[in-house]
Each structure stands twice: as structure tokens, then as C-alpha cells.
Interface confidence: low
């Protein structure tokens, strides 16, 4: 079947990095400057992505693969294939429409991106606060006073942080 198809369609013989040029009797022509074809048999080449402005080239374009971008320092990628760059904030802050704002009391952010999240409520697990939370760090929960006995571990790790962008249920 493959052999039959290639006899009928000369374009299927064109490898990646070329296109099937209808203007030149369907011969395989190299992709023009700043374009690529990642698969064989293509009738056109795709324009290479250009990483300009806040975007920075992470991987250059070639005749068979598109360029890949990331973000300049002070920004981070958002979206599939780094389609957007979003401003970094400091730890203890979140990005709002008015720029970077400090986390409200009772919330924290230990990253340069994402939203401020509520401190862990130790009492929900019957535990007590061992180390107070800050804008940059969650509280550290310890055992309730009744649980303290010789040889017992005095610290348990905090509950896993929720994914950025998810509000507490």
C-alpha cells in the first residue's frame, strides 16, 4: 500500500526539511529561510517561531524543527509551548492586575509565580502550630500537647501545598 501511494503521490517522497513544490513540477525544494517542515510529504513549510521582546530563544529553528522560546529573566512561561510570559513577583507576593502585591495575613507564596495560598489549618488535623507562618512560608504543624511523650517525634511536615490557581475547597 505504501509503495502504491508513493507512486500516485510524488509528494510523499519529500523528506522533512523540504516541501513539495507545485510550481516546480512537484519536486522537493528546501524550506525557505526561517521556515521548517518537521514531517515528510508536506506541501508547504511552516514559518519558524521568532522569540522576540520578552521571549528568549531556548532552541533555534532548523529546517526540520521549530524554534522554542522561554522568557527573559524576571518573567516565567505560561501556556503550551511558552505562549505567554508573565512577570515574576517576589516570594511572599502574588501578581494582580495592579502588579505584584504582598500576600494578605494568613496566606503565603513560597514561589516567584502563582497565587498566595492559605496557611495550613493545623487544628483540622488535631495538631498545634509549631512554627508560625509568614508571607513566604506555611506554618509548621506539630503534635497536639496530649500527643507529646518521651521519644515521640516533635515535628510533622506541613500538608502538601495546593496547586497554584486552585482555591481551597
Amino acid at each position: 500500500f505504501e509503495r502504491t501511494r508513493s507512486l500516485q503521490d510524488p509528494c510523499s517522497n519529500c523528506p522533512a526539511g523540504t516541501f513539495c513544490d507545485n510550481n516546480r513540477n512537484q519536486i522537493c525544494s528546501p524550506c525557505p529561510p526561517n521556515s521548517f517542515s518537521s514531517a515528510g510529504g508536506q506541501r508547504t513549510c511552516d514559518i519558524c517561531r521568532q522569540c522576540k521582546g520578552v521571549f528568549r530563544t531556548r532552541k533555534e529553528c532548523s529546517s526540520t524543527s521549530n524554534a522554542e522560546c522561554d522568557c527573559t529573566p524576571g518573567f516565567h512561561c505560561l501556556g503550551a509551548g511558552c505562549s505567554m510570559c508573565e512577570q515574576d513577583c517576589k516570594q511572599g507576593q502574588e501578581l494582580t492586575k495592579k502588579g505584584c502585591k504582598d500576600c494578605c495575613f494568613g496566606t503565603f507564596n513560597d514561589q516567584k509565580r502563582g497565587i498566595c495560598r492559605p496557611w495550613t489549618n493545623c487544628s483540622l488535623d488535631g495538631k498545634s502550630v509549631l512554627v508560625n507562618g509568614t508571607k513566604e512560608r506555611d506554618v509548621v504543624c506539630g503534635p497536639s500537647p496530649a500527643d507529646l511523650s518521651p521519644g515521640a517525634s516533635s515535628v510533622t511536615p506541613p500538608a502538601p501545598a495546593r496547586e497554584p490557581g486552585h482555591s481551597p475547597q
Partner: antibody, heavy 113, light 110 residues
Amino acid sequence: SLEESGGRLVTPGTPLTLTCTVSGFSLNDYWMSWVRQAPGKGLEWIGYIDVGGSLYYASWAKGRFTISRTSTTVDLKMTSLTTEDTATYFCARGGLTYGFDLWGPGTLVTVSS
Amino acid sequence: DIVMTQTPASVSEPVGGTVTINCQASEDISSYLAWYQQKPGQRPKRLIYGASDLASGVPSRFSASGSGTEYALTISDLESADAATYYCHYYATISGLGVAFGGGTEVVVK
């Protein structure tokens, strides 16, 4: 950063390989090029190796110059050298977006009998 | 191969003056053009890419423009440190047309 090595005084006809050692970035992410400059003359492009390993040469360089790479080096193999090949040889990083944004200091090749 | 013709070969201007260097491509190069500064005994330094985008750390006294086959680099408020040779450079190669440098322009600052 980029650093060329291997330049020296050779006699005509002697083959020579120059090496460009890279640090701080991956050769899988950037095109790399060799450019030369004869004493008192302008810049002359020799060839490219792209991120996929494909090679591009100036028409005058085809056959006598060969570019290859390892994970951290880009080599330029030169054969049938003549006195006209006396030049400083630079390696440069760059591709389709920015031109050549990073250059090595160059290495001098002198061809003389 | 594409040919880049750069003019003038040499230009002399006083400190504070303005210099314009021209570069003509033998065919349309779609703004895939860079400009470099090179001082004697040093490696080239990229000033401009994409025909008009200023490279990081380059003073705004340097500006460039152009499209199609005609391009220009302008240096205003000349300083003695601008004395160097300047090269234009076509850098898109996927079609196999090859890379090309202009012949260079020596800028002398009086």
C-alpha cells in the same frame, strides 16, 4: 562562552583541525558557525551546523572545509591549505532570530612555506 | 550566494557628529540582517539584529533601519570609542543561499 584552539603555523597542503569549546549553553539548542578574517581584511563566513546537525557551507568552502560537533565542541577540519587561508578563525553562536550573538576570541592560522 | 555591498568603505566624522553606513543585498533578505562593530585585534560585537532591533547593552546612539534589499546603520553623537570597522551581515541560511557579510566600513572619529 566560546574558545577556539588549534591555530598554528603550517606549510601549504597540511591538514589542520580547529576546535571551538563551548560552555554555558547546549549545542543542541543553537546554530554554530565558523567565520574567518584574513589580516587587514573583512569577515568571511565558512559554514554552519544547525541544531539538528545539518550542515551549510559557503560555496567556496565546500569540499575543503568540514564542520562537525560533539556535545561540547565544534570542529573545523581544513584540508589542502594554501597561503590564502592565512587568517584568524572565529567560531560564533547564532541562528535565524538574532544573528551571531556570541563570538570566540579567534585563533590564528598561518600558512607559509 | 547573496552578495552584501556596503558603502562607504571609510568615513571620518568629528566627535558629536553622525555617521550613516549603507548595506545593499543582491536580493530581498526579509530583514534577516545584523550589524557588528569590530575594533583592531578584537572579536566582532553584535549591535543590531532583525535589521533594527538593538542588542542588549548597546547604546541608543546606534540605530538601524531598512527592508527588502536596502539597509542602513546610523551612529549619532559620535564618541571616540565608536572608532571601529562596522559590518552588515545576512544570516538566514535554511534555503542554502548562504550567509554573507558586507565588506566593512571603517569609521574614523576626529
